[in-house]
């Protein structure tokens, strides 16, 4: 697994550097998770032809993956820092069940999948410290998540491969949209 943020050689080589600010820490954490997703996508794309498949709509119907929309306050038009932050945290919490699903989906990158999951939990904690309106954040229902997980795991092999591909693609996009918005804050 890659070295967690704050432990790379750049930091070691620059002892005079100021401690990371909250924003820098969040930025670094997202970039670390994106690295992990990139590695997982490599294995997925090498293993199957899902990355070139045009049948994504079939599997997408089963999934309710978080996505940024203009109403979420993260886009430049109608940008709202607090609304956007709530959307980012809520979205990450919703992704957690899908990241749990990914845990048994990789052979050579099993450690990487775990790192992505754990790093996302840490990112959520960082962001919760930044948010003022924690009451507006809705936590997914554990029972609903458990039945969703069971349903996803019961799919045939092709659908499971497609689901894995779609989760990684959507999570990457959500993180990139979050990264963009957070840098505007």
């Amino acid at each position: 697994a890659p070295v967690p943020p704050g432990e790379d050689s750049k930091d070691v080589a620059a002892p005079h550097r100021q401690p990371l600010t909250s924003s820098e820490r969040i930025d670094k954490q997202i970039r670390y998770i994106l690295d992990g997703i990139s590695a997982l996508r490599k294995e997925t794309c090498n293993k199957s032809n899902m990355c070139e498949s045009s049948k994504e709509a079939l599997a997408e119907n089963n999934l309710n993956l978080p996505k940024m929309a203009e109403k979420d306050g993260c886009f430049q038009s109608g940008f709202n820092e607090e609304t956007c932050l709530v959307k980012i945290i809520t979205g990450l919490l919703e992704f957690e069940v899908y990241l749990e699903y990914l845990q048994n989906r990789f052979e050579s990158s099993e450690e990487q999948a775990r790192a992505v999951q754990m790093s996302t939990k840490v990112l959520i904690q960082f962001l919760q410290k930044k948010a003022k309106n924690l009451d507006a954040i809705t936590t997914p229902d554990p029972t609903t998540n458990a039945s969703l997980l069971t349903k996803l795991q019961a799919q045939n092999q092709w659908l499971q491969d497609m689901t894995t591909h779609l989760i990684l693609r959507s999570f990457k996009e959500f993180l990139q949209s979050s990264l963009r918005a957070l840098r505007q804050m």
């Epitope: 600010t21 820098e24 930025d27 970039r31 994106l34 990139s38 940024m68 886009f75 430049q76 038009s77 693609r169 990457k172 996009e173 990139q176 949209s177 990264l179 963009r180 840098r183 505007q184």
Partner: antibody, heavy 119, light 106 residues
Framework: QVTLKESGPTLVKPTQTLTLTCSFS??????????VGWVRQPPGKALEWLAF???????YYSPSLESRLTITKDTSKNQVVLTMTNMDPVDTATYYC??????????????WGQGTLVT | DIQMTQSPSSLSAFVGDGVTMTCWAS??????LNWYHQRPGEAPELLVF???NLQIGVPSRFRGSGSETYFTLTINSLQPEDSGTYFC?????????FGGGTKLEI
């Protein structure tokens, strides 16, 4: 192979609207992390960023020109269009479109069009 | 807006020499700093992204460094084709801003 090409009028009268089209190939503007921006350069001067559009249709504009600029994309045609209203002689410049594409959104322009001089 | 300031505005050197130019950001931009080279009559070309990463195809005599507000671009063993203007760019947040440029004469 990534290519971008700007097209539009070379001569515009004061108060008129300038419409520039950036036609590109070799990448898709529906891929996450991808964006296309417009940058201009008056003769003998520095580069000035104008506008940027992302894969998900999020749009950003230069604050000093925001009221005059509109950027749109047509993903199926592989085109990005910039319109600039109320043109003035000080807007004389070479206008470039450029691509940005990386996982971390460094907003670095790795491919540029040849530029089009608008007077 | 984040202001980008480049220094010097111009410099001249001989083939084989080494030069360093600097770029300051008015506030911290982490490592979100890009460098471009532009020859007269041509479009800019990306040299370095994320402060220190060389773009594919760029010779290793180019080296970018720095973080937060202070960045440098060093060119070792100058070649005639290195002449032109070098621009730094804030890639952290919008509005994207460019420095005024450093004109290098070989």
């Amino acid at each position: 192979q990534v290519t971008l090409k700007e097209s539009g009028p070379t001569l515009v009268k004061p108060t008129q609207t300038l419409t520039l089209t950036c036609s590109f190939s070799g990448f898709s503007l529906s891929t996450s992390g991808v964006g296309v921006g417009w940058v201009r350069q008056p003769p003998g001067k520095a580069l000035e960023w104008l506008a940027f559009i992302f894969w998900d249709d999020d749009k950003y504009y230069s604050p000093s020109l925001e009221s005059r600029l509109t950027i749109t994309k047509d993903t199926s045609k592989n085109q990005v269009v910039l319109t600039m209203t109320n043109m003035d002689p000080v807007d004389t410049a070479t206008y470039y479109c450029a691509r940005s594409a990386d996982d971390y959104l460094y907003y670095s322009f790795d491919y540029w069009g040849q530029g089009t001089l608008v007077t | 807006d984040i202001q980008m300031t480049q220094s010097p505005s111009s410099l001249s050197a001989f083939v084989g020499d080494g030069v360093t130019m600097t770029c300051w950001a008015s506030q911290s931009i982490n490592d979100y700093l890009n460098w471009y080279h532009q020859r007269p009559g041509e479009a800019p070309e990306l040299l370095v992204f994320a402060a220190s990463n060389l773009q594919i195809g760029v010779p290793s005599r180019f080296r970018g460094s720095g973080s937060e507000t202070y960045f440098t671009l060093t060119i070792n063993s100058l070649q005639p084709e290195d002449s032109g203007t070098y621009f730094c760019q804030n890639g952290h947040s919008f509005p994207l801003t460019f420095g005024g440029g450093t004109k290098l004469e070989i």
